[in-house]
Interface confidence: low
């Protein structure tokens, strides 16, 4: 059966569409294309004679159409008025005519949208903001993006006005964006320039970095204070309660043991009127903290397979360290039966299986040092099972 197919079905204004023909009969005299769902001479676009390979334009020809020997019709520079049905009539050599109708839809290229806002400088936990995507157009889908991701599900986010308007209830500092709106139709999509919110907040409790407590005499002490705040916080430093300077960073060259003490960072936001402080202890000493060798203990070292469980414990007196476990040079846990708990200090295996037999050890580490325990050997026994019917398992 004769059929036509539009390539593409949805066409962008100004582009081209090809009306493809399938199952074209072999013995033909010619064929004609018509605008509409039926053969109408007043609406003929073009006729094509096979013998002369001659194309003849019809009354509905706009000069943008091209017919091919395989009967396909190309329409270039389409407009929205071209939307609709097209009918092909094939004149076969047995003079029995066949017809097939197809259609396509022309959509406009969408303009670049823009975002309008009712409040660009909201206060955290207090203000609401409504964004509106402009312009309003027909047959258009409106989408919103926050941080280049689609809208998360949140009771603080509300869509209205056919998704053209996005409302943020009770903004937080994390709502700065950027926000973009996108308009779509079947042939085009366009995204707005990003819009950001200047959310006033803070300061939060300051953080003093680096986190080191111990320093060696003769070193340079360089402390930096940071508190999340908008506008940025103003900082000041106190040492043992005595004001030093109003800077974000504190630098003391060539420190001595006399520089040990309490270092206080004070952060102030002049807009919110809020203040926060953090105190850090600095110890200047010749001693260099080294991670000590941890101890490893087992609740039992010989267990029955598929029946018993075992707990391995890694003990250390050091603070500020992390723990990891190893078995046959593989890091653990390596199976569902292995669980770590109490800050990785305890490794539980439940139940123990034959493949769990072997050497275990733990390692404690911090950013500058690490140490391993002595290995511990876990033995796994299996109770002899009676054979059924005197047959050996095979």
């Amino acid at each position: 059966q004769l059929t036509t197919e539009s390539m593409p079905f949805n066409v962008a204004e100004g582009k081209e569409v090809l009306l493809l023909v399938h199952n074209l009969p072999q013995q033909l005299f010619g064929y004609s294309w018509y605008k509409g769902e039926r053969v109408d001479g007043n609406r003929q676009i073009v006729g094509y004679a096979i013998g002369t390979q001659q194309a003849t334009p019809g009354p509905a020809n706009s000069g943008r159409e091209t017919i091919y020997p395989n009967a396909s019709l190309l329409i270039q520079n389409v407009t929205q008025n071209d939307t609709g049905f097209y009918t092909l009539q094939v004149i076969k050599s047995d003079l029995v005519n066949e017809e097939a109708t197809g259609q396509f839809h022309v959509y406009p290229e969408l303009p670049k949208p823009s975002i309008s806002s009712n409040n660009s400088n909201p206060v955290e936990d207090k203000d609401a903001v409504a964004f509106t995507c402009e312009p309003e157009t027909q047959d258009t889908t409106y989408l919103w993006w926050i941080n280049n991701q689609s809208l998360p599900v949140s009771p603080r986010l509300q869509l209205s006005n056919g998704n053209r308007t996005l409302t943020l209830l009770s903004v937080t500092r994390n709502d700065t964006g950027p926000y973009e709106c996108e308009i779509q139709n079947p042939v085009s999509a366009n995204r707005s320039d990003p819009v950001t919110l200047n959310v006033t907040y803070g300061p939060d409790t300051p953080t003093i970095s680096p986190s080191d407590t111990y320093y060696r005499p003769g070193a340079n002490l360089s402390l930096s204070c940071y508190a999340a705040s908008n506008p940025p916080a103003q900082y000041s430093w106190l040492i043992n309660g005595t004001f030093q300077q109003s800077t974000q960073e504190l630098f003391i060259p060539n420190i001595t043991v006399n520089n040990s003490g309490s270092y206080t960072c004070h952060a102030n936001n002049s807009v919110t009127g809020c203040n926060r402080t953090t105190v850090k202890t600095i110890i200047v000493t010749e001693l260099s903290p080294v991670v000590a060798k941890p101890q490893i203990k087992a609740s039992k070292t010989t267990v029955t397979g598929d029946k018993d469980s075992v707990n391995l414990t890694c003990s250390t007196n050091d603070t500020g360290i992390s723990i990891r476990w190893f078995f046959k040079n593989q890091s653990l846990p390596s199976s569902e039966r292995m669980k770590l708990s109490q800050g990785n200090t305890t490794l539980s295996i439940n139940p123990v299986k034959r493949e769990d037999a072997g050497t275990y050890w733990c390692e404690v580490f911090n950013p500058i040092s690490k140490n391993q325990s002595d290995p511990i050997m876990l033995n796994v026994n299996y109770n002899a099972l009676p054979q059924e019917n005197g047959l050996s398992p095979g």
Partner: antibody, heavy 121, light 111 residues
């Protein structure tokens, strides 16, 4: 594609100075610690200096302390090595190298092609 | 004299497995991660192994690293002629506050 391109090498007399540059591209330069490593002709690798991603921490090999100075300009994606009071034993190919671990597990995953510094009278 | 000690040379025939050792102390290998680098003649070094035993993407699994105490080793299985190169181990040294390399091992693929 990550690229490190050293320049500034050449022939210099003992006691003289040179400034090496390493232009970085293909990655966020300001997120990586950077090192200089050198290799004397026919010899092995010798680490020279490291600078943290923000420039706040700097270390030098004992053999170059006080004579060589490492620095960086993150706005230009460039690493530098200022070489003063040069000696014959500073003759080497100088490589710049990137440390992807920010110094927590120092290693050098990308190296430049090297620039030759010859100290001779 | 390098802080990390490597054999100056090693050799093997194609298809063989060879191992290169690297010996240090508690201030470097014992308490820090080891890396291995390959330097083909006339080229810059290339990272083969980092963090004792991890391979960067693109490095064949014929190369493997291990560490025990204050020693590390690089194993190359299924040796190929293109593996002929200098191999260096390296680690951060807590005492020197600097990165240290081994003296390098020249690997020759025979035959």
């Amino acid at each position: 594609e990550v690229q490190l391109l050293e320049s500034g090498g050449g022939l210099v007399q003992p006691g003289g100075s040179l400034r090496l540059s390493c232009a970085a591209s293909g990655f966020n330069f300001s997120n990586y610690a950077m090192s200089w490593v050198r290799q004397a002709p026919g010899k092995g690798l010798e680490w020279v200096s490291v600078i943290s991603h923000g420039g706040g921490s700097i270390y030098y090999a004992d053999s170059v302390k006080g004579r060589l100075t490492i620095s960086r300009d993150n706005s230009k994606n460039t690493l530098y090595l200022q070489m003063n009071s040069l000696r014959a034993e500073d003759t080497a190919v100088y490589y710049c190298a990137r440390d992807p671990t920010k110094g927590y597990a120092p290693t050098f995953d990308y190296w430049g092609q090297g620039t030759l510094v010859t100290v001779s009278s | 004299q390098s802080v990390l000690t490597q054999p100056p040379s090693a050799s093997g025939t194609p298809g063989q497995r060879v191992t290169i050792s690297c010996s240090g102390s508690s201030s470097n290998i014992g308490n820090n991660y080891v890396s291995w680098y390959q330097q083909l003649p006339g080229t810059a070094p290339k990272l083969l192994i980092y963090a004792d035993s991890r391979r960067p993407s693109g490095v064949p699994d014929r190369f493997s690293g291990s560490k025990s105490g204050t020693s590390a080793s690089l194993a190359i299985s299924g040796l190929r002629s293109e593996d002929e190169a200098d191999y260096y181990c390296g680690a951060w040294d807590l005492s020197l506050n600097g990165y240290v390399f081994g003296g390098g091992t020249k690997l020759t693929v025979l035959g």
